[in-house]
């Protein structure tokens, strides 16, 4: 979707099957107000963008309402009447789901179940990443619904969690974007913490029976 086109770089993001954002970076036209013309059907006339994004006072993108549209976006970026770049793109290939909402944690001994509100459309993966200060990298688990149980946790350790949503590649293709991460939440002994200590605290000595 990027690629140089007469010096024009294009990026498309379909936010949560609600809004399409098309942005361009045209070095050759850096001081020019390029116009964006589009249609969602090959038979329609082009409409001009009514919601431009501006960068340094010049047009650099367009936001389009496109709620739950199973459509091709046909568009033309023009300098006056001269088309600078014309293309057609299947919008859902560029899906970016919204960040998980209402994230909740339910603890039971050495396991936690992370839940959140499922999005209104399917074929998504809900990914939970977690780590303790003892871990060198994030661990990950994902499920088809926002109900992810992680087992084998150490009740004495503090764990940081965050959650995101990804589109399934075999349904939406390889060019989608994962959602933004939810806020990091820290937990220890089933209770929420402000943060996990960067340097791990030494484990408490076990009392002999």
């Amino acid at each position: 979707q990027g690629g140089a086109a007469e010096g024009v770089q294009i990026q498309i993001i379909y936010f949560n099957l609600e809004t399409v954002q098309v942005t361009w970076n045209a070095s050759k036209y850096s001081r020019t107000n390029l116009t964006f013309h589009y249609r969602f059907n090959g038979d329609e006339a082009y409409d001009q963008c009514t919601n431009y994004l501006l960068q340094e006072g010049h047009t650099s993108g367009c936001l389009l309402d496109a709620e739950q549209r199973d459509d091709i976006l046909y568009f033309s970026i023009r300098n006056g009447t001269h088309p600078v770049f014309t293309a057609s793109r299947w919008m859902v290939y560029y899906l970016k789901p919204s960040s998980p909402k209402h994230v909740r944690f339910s603890w039971h001994q050495d396991a936690v179940t992370v839940t959140c509100s499922d999005l209104s459309y399917g074929d998504l993966l809900y990914e939970v990443q977690y780590r303790s200060p003892f871990d060198t990298e994030w661990q990950s688990k994902q499920e088809n619904t926002c109900n992810v149980t992680i087992e084998g946790l150490d009740a004495e350790k503090c764990y940081s969690f965050w959650v995101r949503v990804k589109a399934m590649e075999d349904v939406y293709g390889p060019d989608t974007y994962p959602s933004d991460w939810s806020e990091v939440t820290c937990w220890q002994r089933g209770e929420i913490r402000d943060a996990c200590a960067e340097t791990p605290t030494p484990p408490k000595p076990k009392l002999s029976k």
């Epitope: 770049f85 014309t86 057609s88 290939y93 293709g173 390889p174």
Partner: antibody, heavy 118, light 106 residues
Framework: QVQLQESGPGLVKPSGTLSLTCAVS?????????WSWVRQPPGKGLEWIGE???????NNNPSLKSRVTISVDKSKSQFSLKLSSVTAADTAVYYC???????????WGQGTLVTVSS | DIQMTQSPSTLSASVGDRVTITCRAS??????LAWYQQKPGKAPKLLIY???SLESGVPSRFSGSGSGTEFTLTISSLQPDDFATYYC????????FGQGTKLEIK
């Protein structure tokens, strides 16, 4: 391994409608691929006719658009082409193919010759 | 519509030669271009997609380059199996094929 197989009449009368079906096996027609039709008149080059997504959205060659109908039947794992008001110029080998994401036509049927003649 | 012009129409070469086929788009297509090989009586075979990505299973002697309006397919050392007709295809806006380049034995 995805396989595609075209089927339909090999002879169509002028002004009639050409109808072809492409059966998809070895992969899901409901994947994120597009399903395409391409034709090749005898001794000539390739011409893109159009394509369809499993949800029914189509993207057709503007020069043929008014005559072309592409449809999909997910339950039968097949997609179809109808080309109306045919003339001798529509005589060609017709291929169905899979358009993988944004990466070209990676699987093709073996092609079927359709002759338009009275 | 976007027109694709291939050159040359016919190319005579020998086994071991390095050959280049050019494809020019009538307007910018970014890198949304594929190359195909077709042999008589057979369906086309995908060689290169996104202008320069080699399709799985295709020998590395095939390579593609270019962006915008100018693209090339290069075969670094021709093999007997490479004599065929080659087509470029843009899929940036609708889709269009070039008219083909027939690669024949000199």
């Amino acid at each position: 391994q995805v396989q595609l197989q075209e089927s339909g009449p090999g002879l169509v009368k002028p002004s009639g409608t050409l109808s072809l079906t492409c059966a998809v096996s070895g992969g899901s027609i409901s994947s994120s691929n597009w399903w395409s039709w391409v034709r090749q008149p005898p001794g000539k080059g390739l011409e893109w006719i159009g394509e369809i997504y499993h949800g029914g959205t189509t993207n057709n060659n503007p020069s043929l658009k008014s005559r072309v109908t592409i449809s999909v039947d997910k339950s039968k794992s097949q997609f179809s082409l109808k080309l109306s008001s045919v003339t001798a110029a529509d005589t060609a080998v017709y291929y169905c193919a899979r358009h993988r994401y944004s990466n070209g036509l990676d699987y093709w049927g073996q092609g079927t010759l359709v002759t338009v003649s009275s | 519509d976007i027109q694709m012009t291939q050159s040359p129409s016919t190319l005579s070469a020998s086994v071991g030669d390095r050959v280049t086929i050019t494809c020019r788009a009538s307007q910018s297509i970014s890198n949304w271009l594929a190359w195909y090989q077709q042999k008589p009586g057979k369906a086309p075979k995908l060689l290169i997609y996104k202008a320069s990505s080699l399709e799985s299973g295709v020998p590395s002697r095939f390579s593609g380059s270019g962006s915008g309006t100018e693209f090339t397919l290069t075969i670094s050392s021709l093999q007997p199996d490479d004599f065929a007709t080659y087509y470029c295809q843009q899929y940036n806006h609708y889709s269009t094929f070039g008219q083909g380049t027939k690669l024949e034995i000199k």
